[in-house]
């Protein structure tokens, strides 16, 4: 037999909270358990589902879970079935709702001294207790001479008067919790003696020196009082106007007129209506003075043909907000087409060259009008006026390559030399028309040049080859004065270049021919053995057919090159003694001798009392000091050559003589003793 160990039992439950109906079964065979609600099988959902044999509720629902639940156990083999006791939920809940008018049937029927009943549509279980509020303040039964009665969910006002006007709301609570009205009811019961608005003044914007009118009307029984005040609470009447409102007039119907408005008249005006009873009704309106600021400047715009472009006109700040429109050539632009206005934007669709020109954005309001021009340039691809051409430029002279183009806007032209951008310097100049000037053409300027002319619309380029026409010139120019060593072999080179390889020959300046021991070999003058007679003036002549001839004059001197007869030696001297550095040189012309001590030339005129250079070239230093130590160089030079030789000078302390050393013992190094 099937036995219920645990049976479901009726229980309290809270709306939206968890619950469990327990059911446990014992049977000999295999049984399956299911649940019935009001006799119908219960289907599992996420909210309500079987858990073992029990029925679990994730969130109790007062509508879907009301009724009788029963646990059923069935043995599918024997067909035996057992049912539990019935169980149900006592579901506690509360749900907010609006405050509604129950009596009279509509708001329009509410009159002073009639009964008004409001209903609070908050429901719940168990039945809630209700509390009413007017303008947030709780109401209690019998309040205001028993005119208010709160019976359960209804609030009755009998009779209703102006003092009952306000915002009505309700709250309710029960064992589940509390809820307040989702929508409140505003009760408005007019008191004939209260001032009521018939016509409220509106904000106005006027231009300076124009007039402004504010309308204001109230009604009441008996008729109400009406008063106008300006910002500083100064009353405005036809009898007493404040100084800044001399031109104000208050009409019998309550309207206020201000004429020839000035900036000081701008501000807040208050119209106050006061009935026999009730609070004053204050209406406000502001008088604004119309104004319009200047417009920001436009940058000139450059567009390319075929593109779509927009130019936004930022309207100037103003009151009232200025209206904006675009004009071109004095004609207002349409709102559609190829060139049109869209909002504050000027739209140019598929730009044509003819669209170039000045467009004007206008802005206007009561205070006046402003305008700003924008210059629109339609860029064109450059076209050639003069392309660079292959050119022959003369060495040493200025050379020009032209790259003349035209376009809108004026094109940018850059030049390349051997694919390298050319910088402006002392040799290269690029004029704004695109012409390249090479100020002093050199041989290596002979190469490829390319110019590129561009605008935002596109670019064109062309290249040209420069051939440099070489000057007829000596390379290098011969030294004008040269020396040859007597009785030795000597050569004097002379070479030149030109457009054609020049012929080079030597001759004596006096026109006489070269002696037989002197040969002219392809421009090199060769002396097998120099004699005294070889000295003199010679001319190198370079010539070719197209460029004629050039001459270089050379004066040759025959000399005996310098040799040293006496050279200074490494010398050590006791401190305080005298040092002698000997130096003698020979040559023709007779050489002059100079000394260099410690990296500076010793000027004979500025040597001081301790140093002296003898006629024969020797250097004497008296009373030597340690700082005189160092390398001394003897330099011998004449108009043909220069030679030098050097030796160190050491200055040492004189040793104290020892007993063992006799007076004749020599020092361990070469010493000058004085």
């Amino acid at each position: 037999a099937i036995v219920f160990i645990k049976q479901p039992s009726s229980q309290d439950a809270l709306q939206g909270r968890r619950a469990l109906l327990r059911c446990e079964v014992e049977a000999p065979g295999l049984v399956h358990v299911y649940w019935l609600l009001d006799g119908a099988p219960v289907q599992d959902t996420e909210r309500r589902f079987t858990q073992g044999s029990s029925l679990s509720f994730a969130a109790v629902d007062r509508l879907q879970d009301s009724g009788t639940f029963q646990c059923v156990a069935r043995d599918d083999v024997t067909g035996e079935e057992a049912r539990s006791a019935n169980a149900s939920f006592n579901i506690k809940w509360i749900e907010a709702g609006p405050v509604v008018l129950k009596h009279p049937a509509s708001e329009a029927e509410i009159q002073p001294q009639t009964q008004v009943t409001l209903r609070c549509h908050i429901d719940g279980h168990p039945r809630p207790t209700y509390q009413w509020f007017r303008d947030g303040t709780p109401l209690s039964d019998g309040q205001s001479n028993n005119t208010v009665s709160s019976k359960e969910r209804n609030l009755t006002l009998r009779p209703a008067g102006p003092e009952h006007s306000g915002l009505y709301s309700c709250c309710a609570h029960n064992a589940f919790g509390q809820a307040c009205s989702s929508q409140n009811f505003t009760l408005s019961i007019a008191d004939e003696s209260f001032a009521r608005v018939v016509l409220a003044p509106q904000d106005v914007i006027v231009a300076r020196n124009e007039e402004a009118m504010f309308h204001c009307q109230f009604s009441a029984q008996p008729p109400p009082n009406l008063q106008w005040l300006f910002e500083d609470e100064t009353p405005i009447t036809n009898r007493s106007r404040p100084p800044h409102l001399r031109r104000a007039t208050v009409f019998a119907n309550g309207s206020l007129l201000l004429t020839q408005v000035r900036p000081r008249n701008a501000g807040v005006y208050r119209c106050i209506g006061q009935g026999q009873r009730g609070p004053p009704v204050i209406l406000e309106a502001t008088l604004h003075l119309a104004e319009i600021e200047d417009m920001p400047l436009f940058e000139p715009r450059v567009f390319t043909a075929g593109s779509e472009e927009r130019v936004t006109c930022l309207p100037p700040k103003g009151l009232p907000e200025p209206s904006v429109w675009w004009e071109h050539a004095g004609v207002r632009l349409p709102t559609h087409g190829r060139v049109y206005q869209k909002g504050h934007e000027l739209v140019l669709a598929s730009i044509a060259e003819s669209d170039a020109g000045v467009y004007t954005c206008h802005a206007a309001n009561l205070a006046g009008q402003r305008r700003q021009d924008v210059n629109i340039t339609v860029a064109t691809v450059p076209t050639w006026l003069k392309k660079p051409q292959d050119s022959q430029l003369e060495e040493g002279k200025p050379g020009y390559l032209h790259c003349l183009t035209q376009a809108t806007p004026k094109p940018t032209v850059v030049w390349y030399r051997n694919q390298m951008l050319i910088s402006e310097d002392s040799r290269f100049e690029v004029f704004k028309n695109g012409t390249l000037r090479i100020n002093n053409v050199e041989v290596y300027d002979g190469t490829w040049y390319r110019c590129v002319s561009s605008t935002p619309a596109g670019s064109i380029e062309a290249q040209a080859r420069v051939q440099v026409l070489e000057k007829l010139k000596f390379t290098p120019p011969p030294q004008p004065q040269q020396c040859m060593e007597f009785d030795k072999e000597a050569t004097v080179p002379c070479s030149a270049t030109g457009r054609e390889k020049p012929t080079i020959k030597w001759e004596r300046a006096d026109g006489s021919s070269l002696p037989e021991w002197v040969t002219d070999n392809a421009g090199t003058l060769h002396f097998a053995r120099v004699t005294r007679d070889d000295a003199g003036n010679y001319t190198c002549i370079a010539s070719n057919g197209p460029q004629g001839q050039i001459r270089a004059h050379v004066q040759l001197t025959v000399a005996v090159f310098i040799t040293f007869k006496v050279e200074p030696e490494r010398t050590t001297v006791y401190q305080g003694h005298t040092a002698l550095l000997q130096c003698e040189a020979q040559g023709d012309p007779k050489p002059l001798i100079q000394w260099k001590g410690k990296d500076r030339i010793l000027d004979p005129t500025k040597l001081g009392p301790r140093m002296h250079i003898f006629q024969n070239g020797s250097l004497v230093i008296h009373d030597v000091a340690p700082e005189d130590s160092g390398r001394y160089t003897c330099i011998a030079g004449n108009s043909c050559n220069i030679k030098h030789t050097e030796a160190p000078l050491y200055v040492v302390d004189k040793p104290v003589p020892e007993e063992s050393e006799g007076p004749g013992s020599p020092p361990p190094y070469k010493m000058i003793q004085t």
């Epitope: 690029v430 004029f431 704004k432 561009s454």
Partner: antibody, heavy 118, light 111 residues
Framework: QVQLQQSGAELVKPGASVKLSCTAS????????IHWVKLRTEQGLEWIGR????????KYAPKFQGKATITADTSSNTAYLQLSSLTSEDTAVYYC???????????WGQGTLVTVSA | DIVLTQSPASLAVSLGQRATISCRAS??????????MNWFQQKPGQPPKLLIY???NQGSGVPARFSGSGSGTDFRLNIHPMEEDDTAMYFC?????????FGGGTKLEIK
Amino acid sequence: QVQLQQSGAELVKPGASVKLSCTASDFNIKDFYIHWVKLRTEQGLEWIGRIDPEDGETKYAPKFQGKATITADTSSNTAYLQLSSLTSEDTAVYYCARASSGPWFAYWGQGTLVTVSA
Amino acid sequence: DIVLTQSPASLAVSLGQRATISCRASESVDNYGISFMNWFQQKPGQPPKLLIYAASNQGSGVPARFSGSGSGTDFRLNIHPMEEDDTAMYFCQQSKEIPWTFGGGTKLEIK
């Protein structure tokens, strides 16, 4: 060699105007664009505008439109910068510079100091 | 207008070391294969001197230790090795479109 010689320093009162000059030597200003640049220590360099002395065409930075007027006299090979309604913000060193159709400044004037002070 | 943002605002570099100054443009300054970005050096009391034109080309008489690189919107000026004489303000400048504009400048000093 190419030189741009600018006029001397100016001390001017607020609200007044001043006209600076830039005379070119060793080149013809008609062959180049002449630009003007403003230097203030804190703000750095600012491009004012340029003129094509050949046809008088000018271009200005929006900031200097209405403030600066650039002109040129080709007969004296001189470009001018006029500054109007001067305020302390206009106290600066003003340079003229030469550019060709390759848009870079290879040559500059030595600068003119303008001081605006009451 | 094309806005140029230079960084850093100031820089101290040891003698012999490398100094790098950056310049970023608010839009590309390239046109038909050329980057219209130039670099200037300015010393107190002197006009600016053109160091680099068209992003990477050395101005006339500018020592080889100054070099420029970059294209589009990002550019750099390199100085290596740094010398005493390089203490100055450095400005980038675009000449792709009017109005020509300058960067805010970088003050370069010896560390």
